[in-house]
Interface confidence: low
């Protein structure tokens, strides 16, 4: 018995269906096929869980959190013992193993390993201003999404004809900050932050209005 080499890893957007591949070749009839799918969750590597089991011509549910969401992609018994996971959750991220036995066929590699990563588009980011908006001050524009896997990058742009930040601005796309030094009237306007990762984008807007000092009355 020989389990085929897996593609290594599968990525899927949260809520969508993941298909975890596992197939094997055997010299024996599929009369005594046993298949166990296990997961080592990324969130708790010390606690492997059973995902689904095929034994004695019957399917058995694994851990409670997989009930009603998991099944074999094809009719069992078969040499393709791939499974699907519906409505994927962040907690489904982990290393999945298929363990195959088909007596009397012994020897060879009977385990296949596939990583599953559940991706999450950036949640609506929060846009904030830090610092005084008085003329000549330094301000920091902050942008942050609570959710997003892979970790989002943040791009700030000024919503005018150029879409360019003021010349005194420096941007950190990883942290989501823009520092604008010595703000002037030209710094005023609407700014947009775009949080993006491989599967989606989300935006927030911020209105920066530079406050000019009032002329002192004599």
């Amino acid at each position: 018995l020989e389990v085929s080499e897996s593609p290594g890893s599968v990525q899927v957007a949260r809520g969508q269906t993941a298909v975890l591949p596992c197939a094997f070749s055997t010299s024996a009839a599929l009369l005594n096929l046993n298949v166990i799918w296990m997961v080592i969750p990324l969130s708790n590597a010390n606690q492997p869980e059973q995902v689904i089991l095929y034994q004695g011509g019957q399917m058995f549910d694994g851990a409670l959190r997989f009930h009603g969401r998991v099944g074999f992609t094809g009719t069992m018994p078969a040499t393709n013992v791939s499974i699907f996971i519906n409505n994927t959750q962040l907690s489904d991220t982990g290393t999945y193993q298929c363990l195959v036995n088909n007596l009397p066929d012994r020897g060879g590699r009977n385990i296949g390993v596939t990583g599953l990563t559940v991706l999450v588009p950036p949640s609506a980011p929060q846009c904030q201003i830090q610092g005084s908006q008085d003329l000549g001050s330094d301000v920091i524009l902050l942008c942050s999404s609570e959710e997003g896997i892979p970790r989002p990058t943040y791009l700030w742009e000024k919503l005018d004809n150029t879409l360019k930040l003021p010349p005194t601005a420096t941007q950190d796309q990883v942290q989501g900050t823009v520092t604008i030094r010595n703000i002037s009237a030209l710094s005023s306007g609407l700014y947009q932050c775009v949080a993006s990762n491989a599967i989606g984008t989300s935006t927030c807007l911020l209105d920066l209005q530079v406050i000019s000092p009032q002329p002192r009355s004599v």
Partner: antibody, heavy 123, light 111 residues
Framework: QLQLQESGPGLVKPSETLSLTCTVS??????????WGWIRQPPGKGLEWIGS???????YYNPSLKSRVTISVDTSKNQFSLKLSSVTAADTAVYYC???????????????WGQGTMVTVSS | QAVLTQPPSVSGAPGERVTLSCTGT?????????VHWYQQFPGTAPRLLIF???NRPSGVPDRFSGSKSGTSASLAITGLQVEDEADYYC???????????FGGGTKLTVL
């Protein structure tokens, strides 16, 4: 309206790097929510997605080509580019650039295409 | 080898109704991802014909319609016209490959 135009050499030698640029006109490449992709079509064959990029620089590629592909974006020029290294005759194809929105299960079709540019790999 | 399977050729007479099929797997069409259809004339770029399995972009006649069931999708063309003669491609997202996949294309001939 938005238009895309591919440009680059029509002939590349085997083992060299294929380089193409797509220029976006009639709209901004920085439009929120839109991704920009490359698709190719060998003579007489079907379409193959190569990879896509967001204007912030986020990229993702066809796993079968990933080791040879680099896609980059230049927002100041409203352009995005494709580099495919170590080319062989099998990379001979019409290369298209196209726009698509990435929202899983929602409008992730390639809705605007360039006219395509033929690239031949030959010594 | 294309990930989505389409018949290489389909033909029909003017005025007839033809159906073009696109068969996928549980990791693409069957994973509840939308199927999109493109029309391509010789020497030109593909044009989006149907998106989201059954939606038409503006300018596409209502003679074209899409549907999806299980791991298969279909493009139906009613009142076939000579100018419909072209190649048709289906496309979907594939969770196993983490990318967009196309069918091999169907050449539609109007007799």
């Amino acid at each position: 309206q938005l238009q895309l135009q591919e440009s680059g050499p029509g002939l590349v030698k085997p083992s060299e790097t294929l380089s193409l640029t797509c220029t976006v006109s009639g709209g901004s490449i920085s439009s929120s929510g839109y991704y920009w992709g490359w698709i190719r079509q060998p003579p007489g064959k079907g379409l193959e997605w190569i990879g896509s990029i967001y204007y912030s620089g986020s990229t993702y590629y066809n796993p079968s080509l990933k080791s040879r592909v680099t896609i980059s974006v230049d927002t100041s020029k409203n352009q995005f580019s494709l580099k495919l290294s170590s080319v062989t005759a099998a990379d001979t194809a019409v290369y298209y650039c196209a726009r698509h929105r990435v929202r899983f299960g929602e409008f992730d079709a390639f809705d605007i295409w360039g006219q395509g540019t033929m690239v031949t790999v030959s010594s | 080898q294309a990930v989505l399977t389409q018949p290489p050729s389909v033909s029909g007479a003017p005025g007839e109704r033809v159906t073009l099929s696109c068969t996928g797997t549980s990791s693409n069409v069957g994973a509840d991802f939308d199927v999109h259809w493109y029309q391509q004339f010789p020497g030109t770029a593909p044009r989006l014909l149907i998106f989201g399995s059954d939606n038409r972009p503006s300018g596409v006649p209502d003679r074209f319609s899409g549907s999806k069931s299980g791991t298969s999708a279909s493009l139906a063309i009613t009142g076939l016209q000579v100018e419909d003669e072209a190649d048709y491609y289906c496309q979907a997202y594939d969770v196993r490959l983490s990318g967009w996949v196309f069918g091999g294309g169907t050449k539609l001939t109007v007799l």
